[in-house]
Interface confidence: low
Amino acid sequence: IWELKKDVYVVELDWYPDAPGEMVVLTCDTPEEDGITWTLDQSSEVLGSGKTLTIQVKEFGDAGQYTCHKGGEVLSHSLLLLHKKEDGIWSTDILKDQKEPKNKTFLRCEAKNYSGRFTCWWLTTISTDLTFSVKSSRGSSDPQGVTCGAATLSAERVRGDNKEYEYSVECQEDSACPAAEESLPIEVMVDAVHKLKYENYTSSFFIRDIIKPDPPKNLQLKPLKNSRQVEVSWEYPDTWSTPHSYFSLTFCVQVQGKSKREKKDRVFTDKTSATVICRKNASISVRAQDRYYSSSWSEWASVPCS
Amino acid sequence: RNLPVATPDPGMFPCLHHSQNLLRAVSNMLQKARQTLEFYPCTSEEIDHEDITKDKTSTVEACLPLELTKNESCLNSRETSFITNGSCLASRKTSFMMALCLSSIYEDLKMYQVEFKTMNAKLLMDPKRQIFLDQNMLAVIDELMQALNFNSETVPQKSSLEEPDFYKTKIKLCILLHAFRIRAVTIDRVMSYLNAS
């Protein structure tokens, strides 16, 4: 058993039929010694008396809020949550496996630049009785500070008969140098509580590996005289690290017809302009990637040929 | 130790070209190592991230772009204060900071070159003959060192009499390649910045 936060405790259980469970001793937080009784949740049934209560926790029925009273007055609470371990593996029932970039990916994180700010998100089909708390650090043995905000519901989607909920959190490394070479990874830990079930999810990464620039901005077309060609120009996104000559991007320019089946012409360039043929009803898209460290491409910025 | 903003020296262009080749070569070599040593811990997640140049060179600090010198977090590991008097930064050729940056890069390359050559000698003794260092990568390191044009004593190749532990050598190769790739990215960024300044 360990304390998750004040008055909230997690009991780790091997989860199999007829498992013996864990013996837990609860102590009432009071100077009083006599006339103390214990109840569970909203029940008035007295479970025991005395300053301590010893219970055998085997299943969810044994978890919940234990309260000690004296003469009708509440003295203190202890909330017990269960963390299930089946066949040596901690349960992952609360979050959905996003399967990208590999199986058992529950948390996904991205950074728009090298400032030390990043966003993580996760998916669940659970809509109520759900709380998340997020902690993060640089390294684990001698952790350096990373500050995370509160996790918020960022999107809802319908997937077949199910609704899927996306939660996200923003974190910022307390003292990040954009030019630094990372040798210790960022660790992100998400505590998820659904009713009386506790689970934790972790992700470990270097900022350089989760970089995904915003799309190029100010995408413009300039027709060239007596030609079907246009000069496409764009700018670095505002959110990208500066100076741009140090944090350089490379770009992919694509001409895409109306139909997805039509041929896509692609040009790769380190410059912020390119000359392409604009076909009727086609659109021109540009995306960006760190020029020197091949992490993710940005989403496309697009403009119609017409 | 910041990079000066000054008129480009034509001499930077070959360095930019060589640094691009370097990054390409080390990335290819790392990819090859990850594929060849697929049953060894050779991915970024599996290896320990060690920097053989730690406490010996200070490339990131010495080559910090001027624009980042206002960032406290980029300065906290620096033992010398910045020269803010612009006059000594007017000419790149005479810039002490510039020389410090490029000599730090040169020292990095020299250290990695020695490590890689020593490692290759061990790998050549491996009866499995599983992996060797790409000669192109070693050549590219050499070319960039020549382009940087610093004279320094030749560091003798480390030799050891004992039978190498080939497993450990291959793990070390992965560690070195990962670290060198990260340094090659920094070098490329620096050369690009200098080229544009």
């Epitope: 041929k263 012409d265 692609r266 040009v267 360039t269 390119a274 000359t275 392409v276 043929i277 | -």
Partner: antibody, heavy 119, light 107 residues
Framework: EVTLRESGPALVKPTQTLTLTCTFS??????????VSWIRQPPGKALEWLAH???????YYNPSLKSRLTISKDTSKNQVVLTMTNMDPVDTATYYC???????????WGQGTTVTVSS | DVVMTQSPDSLAVSLGERATINCKAS??????VAWYQQKPGQPPKLLIY???NRYTGVPDRFSGSGYGTDFTLTISSLQAEDVAVYYC?????????FGGGTKVEIK
């Protein structure tokens, strides 16, 4: 070490379909902005680019031959295949496969395979 | 399509002398031009990319320059092993196109 090797028939009859295979090693089409191109060179003439396939299976073709060309890849076998339909004597040439990286043009070439179209 | 016009068609230069080959694009191709060297019975070899970047292992007597529509390959001091046909190529836009080639011989 990067190597590419072309294979296919040395002689093809007019109207037949040519299938050429490029087997490569030393790089992978699984990752990054790598691609393989086919280029041909008629005897004593200049080079002509035919088709290209990217790591993510995006393909594109020389418009003048597009209707006759198909390029595909088998990433697991490290192979890229080019088919060219309705062959004609003017298609007699040495056919090369080449690797193309994002910033380095056609940096590696196969030795080429000579294809003669004749009845 | 972008037409790459090379000049001259052939060039005879004395050993140790400078050889200059020109390539003109029918429209701007920025600096996305490569130069290749092809010896008889061999595939082409990449010499220069991005108009002026020497490829790994290429001797420094080879240099490239130009931007937009006009490009030049220079061999500063011709060696016997430089006898070959040289091609320029643009990969700025699809279809990628080559010049007609310039044959370099020893005078």
């Amino acid at each position: 070490e990067v190597t590419l090797r072309e294979s296919g028939p040395a002689l093809v009859k007019p109207t037949q379909t040519l299938t050429l295979t490029c087997t490569f090693s030393g790089f992978s089409l699984r990752k990054s902005v790598m691609g393989v191109s086919w280029i041909r060179q008629p005897p004593g003439k200049a080079l002509e680019w035919l088709a290209h396939i990217y790591w993510d299976d995006d393909k594109y073709y020389n418009p003048s031959l597009k209707s006759r060309l198909t390029i595909s890849k088998d990433t697991s076998k490290n192979q890229v295949v080019l088919t060219m339909t309705n062959m004609d004597p003017v298609d007699t040439a040495t056919y090369y496969c080449t690797r193309r990286g994002i910033r380095s043009a056609m940096d590696y070439w196969g030795q080429g395979t000579t294809v003669t179209v004749s009845s | 399509d972008v037409v790459m016009t090379q000049s001259p068609d052939s060039l005879a230069v004395s050993l140790g002398e400078r050889a200059t080959i020109n390539c003109k694009a029918s429209q701007s191709v920025s600096n996305d031009v490569a130069w290749y060297q092809q010896k008889p019975g061999q595939p082409p070899k990449l010499l220069i990319y991005y108009a002026s970047n020497r490829y790994t292992g290429v001797p420094d007597r080879f240099s490239g320059s130009g931007y937009g529509t006009d490009f030049t390959l220079t061999i500063s001091s011709l060696q016997a092993e430089d006898v070959a046909v040289y091609y320029c190529q643009q990969d700025y836009n699809s279809p990628w196109t080559f010049g007609g080639g310039t044959k370099v011989e020893i005078k």
